[in-house]
């Protein structure tokens, strides 16, 4: 498989058959698949060097792995997008052997002197062809030469099979399956041959191709493949319930932010709640996690403005649940990204020198910001798309807080909507879905560059639009939701999570 190890070295060779038998639409589809693959790999913070070859009678090398920009995913994607099927129109035979020889030439080194680290570089060839080579001879001989060059299968104690993967995608109206199978790698419990119909569900294909065992701790990563569970798609999501004898129980959500901490809303708990009465589950697992302590933001005080006629005051409504035992990350349990951390800088593919302010400008610009939250409906987790009103609609969004029960007598809305809040909901630019009571404490998320970054914690809503946890279809335009802006509670997060190796900026 393609081992996505951010500390490893990898060359990926994209080889695309542009011969007569492929056809323009299949060529375009294959290109799209490769663009998606480049993006998927880049989302892991891995920067492989790319080689890009198209071929028919002759190969054409568009990107060499030795080029300075070959590890710049955006630049490689641009080169790929600029390739036309017509480029090979005049010489449209199929010489797959020559194309693979072009790959071999990129792999080999001058004067037979291998560069430092050659033996630690993994090589991945992704060949998109119909397998109908009609000139140049059998391409399998070049695969053998490549294996020889990379010293694969020659050393009994160190076969190095994981240093070469050859994936073949069968594209075109007629595919020679025998030829395609012959070229692809053969490894136990791995799939290296894919058909056209597989390309309709690329996430399923990538799931077969990618080994992410070296990058399970990456924040904000998800798998969207069809066989995935809700927690493959939202692996950070935590379910919290507080059992209060004779008072029933409170349900909330939270987000895994590190191996020991879940971030949630402070209002989910009271000072009387004991640790043993708080149940937290992650990854869709039945068992509950043991709680060491719940850490409230020191400025949170729900009764802080009672004397001013404000029954409930949600400023600084954030809490961290510290777990007794370290979480074991996997595909259904992994952290979400937090603002102003090194992990988020890498997730957004920003320069290492990026400041907290620059992250804020990237994630929360002064405009309507597309975001999402995760809600449970009929035992299923679903993503709800909302817009954070952070531009010209911010004021009107915040003013609608006056319609909240108990806030109708508030003279100045800034008494309840402090600078700590982000506002969503309403009908412009789109009708936003609203949060339900059980969504409290869950993350408000910005999805960028295939990664998920938490910008807020769901706190309170103006209208209870969820009778019996069922969202009503018709809701008033003033149905707004308020979320604690994580950029505003960073000093506290940084202090409490200082041992979690998150690299706060």
């Amino acid at each position: 498989k393609i081992v996505l190890d951010p500390s490893g070295s990898m060359n990926i060779y994209l080889v695309l058959d542009g011969s007569d038998s492929i056809g323009a639409s299949n060529f375009t589809g294959a290109k799209k698949c490769l663009v998606n693959l480049i993006e998927k790999v880049a989302s892991y913070g891995v920067k492989p060097r790319y080689g890009l070859v198209t071929y028919a009678t002759y190969p054409k090398i568009w990107v060499k792995v030795s080029e300075a920009d070959s590890s710049n995913a955006d630049w490689v994607t641009k080169q790929l997008n600029e390739i036309n099927y017509e480029d090979h129109k005049l010489k449209s035979g199929t010489n797959t052997k020559k194309a693979l020889q072009a790959v071999y030439s990129m792999m080999s080194w001058p004067d037979d002197v291998p560069p430092e680290g050659w033996n630690r570089t993994r090589h991945v060839i992704i060949l998109m062809t119909d397998g109908l080579h009609n000139m140049g001879g059998d391409p399998i001989t070049v695969i053998d030469e490549i294996r020889d060059l990379l010293y694969i299968g020659k050393d009994r104690k160190n076969p190095r099979e994981d240093y070469l993967d050859v994936y073949v995608f069968g594209v075109g109206p007629l595919v020679n399956q025998v030829n395609i199978n012959a070229l692809a790698s053969k490894k136990d419990n791995e799939q290296h041959v894919f058909k056209v119909k597989d390309m309709e569900n690329l996430e399923d294909v990538f799931y077969q191709m990618i080994d992410e065992s070296q990058s399970l701790s990456l924040c904000g990563m998800v798998w969207e493949h069809r066989k995935g569970t809700d927690y493959h798609k939202q692996p950070w999501q935590a379910k919290i319930s507080v059992i209060r004898p004779s008072k029933g129980h409170e349900s909330c959500m939270g987000a895994v932010v590190s191996e020991y901490f879940v971030l949630t809303a402070a209002h989910c708990f009271t000072v009387d709640d004991k640790e043993h009465s708080i149940k937290v589950s992650v990854g869709g697992e039945k068992r509950d996690l043991e709680i060491e302590v719940v850490l409230f933001h020191p400025n949170y005080n729900i009764n802080g403005k009672k004397e001013a006629g404000i029954p409930e005051f949600y400023d600084y409504d954030v809490a961290l649940i510290k777990l007794k035992n370290k979480l074991k990350y996997g595909q259904t349990i992994r952290p979400i990204c937090l603002p102003c951390t090194e992990g988020t800088t890498r997730a957004l593919r920003l320069p290492p020198t990026t400041t907290c302010q620059q992250q804020k400008e990237e994630l929360l610009p002064a405009q309507d910001i597309k975001a999402l939250f995760v809600s449970e409906e009929e035992k299923k987790l679903t993503r709800k798309e909302v817009y954070i009103k952070n531009g010209d609609k911010k004021g009107s969004c915040e003013r609608d807080a006056q319609y909240a029960p108990g806030y109708d007598k508030v003279k100045d809305i800034s008494e309840v909507v402090t600078p700590r809040f982000l506002c969503t909901g309403g009908v412009s630019p789109y009708a936003d879905p609203n949060t339900c009571r059980g969504d409290s404490g869950g993350p408000l998320i910005v999805h960028k560059r295939s990664r998920f970054i938490q910008v807020g914690v769901i706190s309170w809503g103006v209208v209870d639009v969820c009778k019996n946890q069922k969202r009503q279809k018709q809701v008033p335009a003033h149905a707004r939701d308020f979320h604690i802006n994580l950029f505003q509670v960073l000093p506290w997060l940084k202090e409490k999570l200082q041992d979690e190796d998150l690299g706060f900026l």
Epitope: K154, D155, R156
Partner: antibody, heavy 121, light 111 residues
Framework: EVQLVESGGGLVQPGGSLRLSCGTT????????MSWVRQAPGKGLEWLGF??????????EYAASVKGRFTISRDNSKNTLYLQMNSLKTEDTAVYYC????????????WGQGTLVTVSS | EIVLTQSPATLSLSPGERATLSCKAS??????????MNWYQQKPGQAPRLLIY???NLESGIPARFSGSGSGTDFTLTISSLEPEDGATYYC?????????FGQGTKLEIK
């Protein structure tokens, strides 16, 4: 056809130095471990060390009995293996063989004919 | 280092007889499902010749009367029906752990 030919043996005084060479033909030299083995008169075989193949950067490994005194090196452009022997002792008197160590199964599948080194005053 | 002990030190048998040579290792020479034990034949004045690799695999060009068996620490070289030319010294050698080591050898005499 695989061939290994040792050279450089002879008479040397205790404390002296000698460099043995092993020229090879018939195979891709850099892809193989290459070993030195010796046999004292009337005694058994003693492995002295090897030079690993290209994946391991041709790094050497030595038997404890010669570590620090003997050095194994290779010139891949000449397909030749070397054994530099310093501070020689009378007990180093032996026939010295070079052998191709096949990483496909970690066995010495081809041997040279040997070269005799005599350490004596 | 791994010490290899061969027995018997010498063996005297007639042509057509079966020869069984033993080699015991001070610790296992197995790695990842393979036994890294090799057998060599050496005749006087000649270089050693590989007979068996990885405990039981016959090197090409070696007569089928030679066979190897064993795993872990106990290994056997068997010559099913001795020929006059089999008179030689036989060495076992392990290549599982560095440094490589040889047994002290078994001298086989043909009567």
């Amino acid at each position: 056809e695989v061939q290994l030919v040792e050279s450089g043996g002879g008479l040397v005084q205790p404390g002296g130095s000698l460099r043995l060479s092993c020229g090879t033909t018939g195979f891709t030299f850099r892809d193989y471990y290459m070993s030195w083995v010796r046999q004292a008169p009337g005694k058994g075989l003693e492995w002295l060390g090897f030079s690993r193949h290209r994946v391991y950067g041709y790094t050497p490994e030595y038997a404890a009995s010669v570590k620090g005194r003997f050095t194994i090196s290779r010139d891949n452009s000449k397909n030749t293996l070397y054994l530099q022997m310093n501070s020689l002792k009378t007990e180093d008197t032996a026939v010295y063989y070079c052998a191709r160590d096949n990483p496909g199964y970690y066995a010495m599948d081809y041997w040279g004919q040997g070269t005799l080194v005599t350490v004596s005053s | 280092e791994i010490v290899l002990t061969q027995s018997p030190a010498t063996l005297s048998l007639s042509p057509g007889e079966r020869a069984t040579l033993s080699c015991k290792a001070s610790q296992s020479v197995d790695y990842d499902g393979d036994s890294y034990m090799n057998w060599y034949q050496q005749k006087p004045g000649q270089a050693p010749r590989l007979l068996i690799y990885a405990a039981s695999n016959l090197e090409s060009g070696i007569p089928a009367r030679f066979s190897g068996s064993g795993s872990g620490t106990d290994f056997t070289l068997t010559i099913s029906s001795l020929e006059p030319e089999d008179g030689a010294t036989y060495y076992c050698q392990q290549s599982n752990a560095d440094p490589y080591t040889f047994g002290q050898g078994t001298k086989l005499e043909i009567k």
